[in-house]
């Protein structure tokens, strides 16, 4: 799995809704693949981490003043939806086909 | 200044183009306010850090399994342009009025 020593990438993160207390309203799925963005944003920032100009600047400043300025951070830059079956306010099971922003599609350095 | 113990916020970061080697092509300004996103993304994530659903989920999983999953990260969520005067290949000064993504407008937890 990607640690701090490896470069920014998408890694598996299985989330169980019971673990986070969301099983009280999400009926299904019981768990899903959320993914996680892990790893460092090291100089030089590669194209695959789609760095913004600010991330490039911050990386260069970090090189020069590592104690003063942090590195850019490996974060989700694009998210995907999942489908969930949930209980509405009246306890009626309802399907949300497109529950936005739940799973990582892409990671990058920001 | 915002450290890891404080919550995610925008802090000052004056960038000198000479420090990062960009003075070879940027004539002016000599330095600019880039800002930096600093601080932690702690539970519960406040509205002002505009968390995505994935950031909320990751924060909850981190609470449950702090050694397995990292916290969400404080990063620029909106960037602003600056104007730069640069030297072209012939050494002629030319203005880029809207040089995108150079300065942080907003920080958030992602």
């Amino acid at each position: 799995s990607a640690g701090a020593g490896s470069h920014c990438q998408k890694t598996s993160l299985r989330v169980n809704f019971e673990d986070i207390g969301w099983d009280s309203w999400i009926i299904a799925p019981k768990e899903y693949e959320a993914y996680e963005c892990k790893g460092g944003c090291f100089f030089p920032l590669a194209d695959d981490v789609t760095p913004t100009k600010h991330a490039i600047v911050q990386t260069l400043v970090h090189l020069k003043f590592p104690t003063k300025v942090g590195k850019a951070c490996c974060v989700p830059t694009k998210l995907s939806p999942i489908s969930v079956l949930y209980k509405d306010d009246m306890g009626v099971p309802t399907l949300k086909y497109h529950y936005e922003g739940m799973s990582v599609a892409e990671c990058g350095c920001r | 200044s915002a450290g890891a113990g404080s919550h995610c916020q925008k802090t000052s970061l004056r960038v000198n183009f000479e420090d990062i080697g960009w003075d070879s092509w940027i004539i002016a300004p000599k330095e600019y306010e880039a800002y930096e996103c600093k601080g932690g993304c702690f539970f519960p994530l406040a509205d002002d850090v505009t968390p995505t659903k994935h950031a909320i989920v990751q924060t909850l999983v981190h609470l449950k399994f702090p050694t397995k999953v990292g916290k969400a990260c404080c990063v620029p969520t909106k960037l602003s342009p600056i104007s730069v005067l640069y030297k072209d290949d012939m050494g002629v000064p030319t203005l880029k009025y809207h040089y995108e993504g150079m300065s942080v407008a907003e920080c958030g937890c992602r």
Epitope: - | P29, S80, I82, L85, D88, D89, V92, K96, Y97, H98
Partner: antibody
Framework: EVQLVESGGGLVKPGGSLRLSCAAS????????LSWVRQAPGKGLEWVGR??????????DYAAPVKGRFTISRDDSKNTLYLQMNSLKTEDTAVYYC?????WGQGTLVTVSS | QSVLTQPPSASGTPGQRVTISCSVT????????VHWYQQLPGMAPKLLFF??YRPSGVSDRFSGSKSGTSASLAIVGLQSEDEGYYYC???????????FGGGTKLTVLG
């Protein structure tokens, strides 16, 4: 020596069209972001729009009063900038300058009148 | 009404010092990016300076400063050939391009 020379101005009726050109020399045209700025008679300067270099995406941006009516394009092989003006209005009457921000042409007068 | 406010006119006698102000009245304009143009009668505008860059051929009698939400152009040792219009210009983030002040007509008296 940097030179920007505009042409194509003239008298046109409201609703008509006109295409302005700006011939450039003395700098690396393909790298430059180029703008059109206009000045109505006796008035101040007003930004019309800008085109980025191809390496920066070649995208265009326009001021609200001209959006949807004016189109900026460039031909890097000819070192020429263009401004296609459609659905012209009397309030478009002005001297039109092309500029790199640092250098400006002498301008070309566009008069929209019936 | 321009979001950069200049006085419509200014005047002085030869040898005097004249200051022209430019006030930012919109949060989309960053005072850091304000610069100045000179337009002499019947001529195209000419860049006076941008940040601390002064194009070759521009007299060092012209200088600029910024404070709070205002920028100023100072001309020392006023000369008759300085007569004309002076425009401040800034970067309008919302408009994605430069915005110009209304212009100040400088008259050299006597």
């Amino acid at each position: 020596e940097v030179q920007l020379v505009e042409s194509g101005g003239g008298l046109v009726k409201p609703g008509g069209s006109l295409r302005l050109s700006c011939a450039a020399s003395g700098f690396t045209f393909s790298n430059a972001w180029l703008s059109w700025v206009r000045q109505a008679p006796g008035k101040g300067l007003e930004w019309v729009g800008r085109i980025k270099s191809k390496t920066d995406g070649g995208t265009t941006d326009y001021a609200a009063p001209v959006k949807g009516r004016f189109t900026i394009s460039r031909d890097d092989s000819k070192n020429t900038l263009y401004l296609q003006m459609n659905s012209l209005k009397t309030e478009d009457t002005a001297v039109y300058y092309c500029t790199t921000g640092t250098y400006w042409g002498q301008g070309t007068l566009v008069t929209v009148s019936s | 009404q321009s979001v950069l406010t200049q006085p419509p006119s200014a005047s002085g006698t030869p040898g005097q010092r004249v200051t022209i102000s430019c006030s930012v009245t919109n949060s989309d304009i960053d005072i850091d990016n304000v610069h100045w143009y000179q337009q002499l009668p019947g001529m195209a505008p000419k860049l006076l300076f941008f940040h601390d860059y002064r194009p070759s051929g521009v007299s060092d009698r012209f200088s600029g400063s910024k404070s709070g939400t205002s920028a100023s152009l100072a001309i020392v040792g006023l000369q008759s050939e300085d007569e004309g219009y002076y425009y401040c210009a800034g970067l309008d983030v919302a408009m994605r391009g430069p915005v110009f002040g209304g212009g100040t007509k400088l008259t050299v008296l006597g």
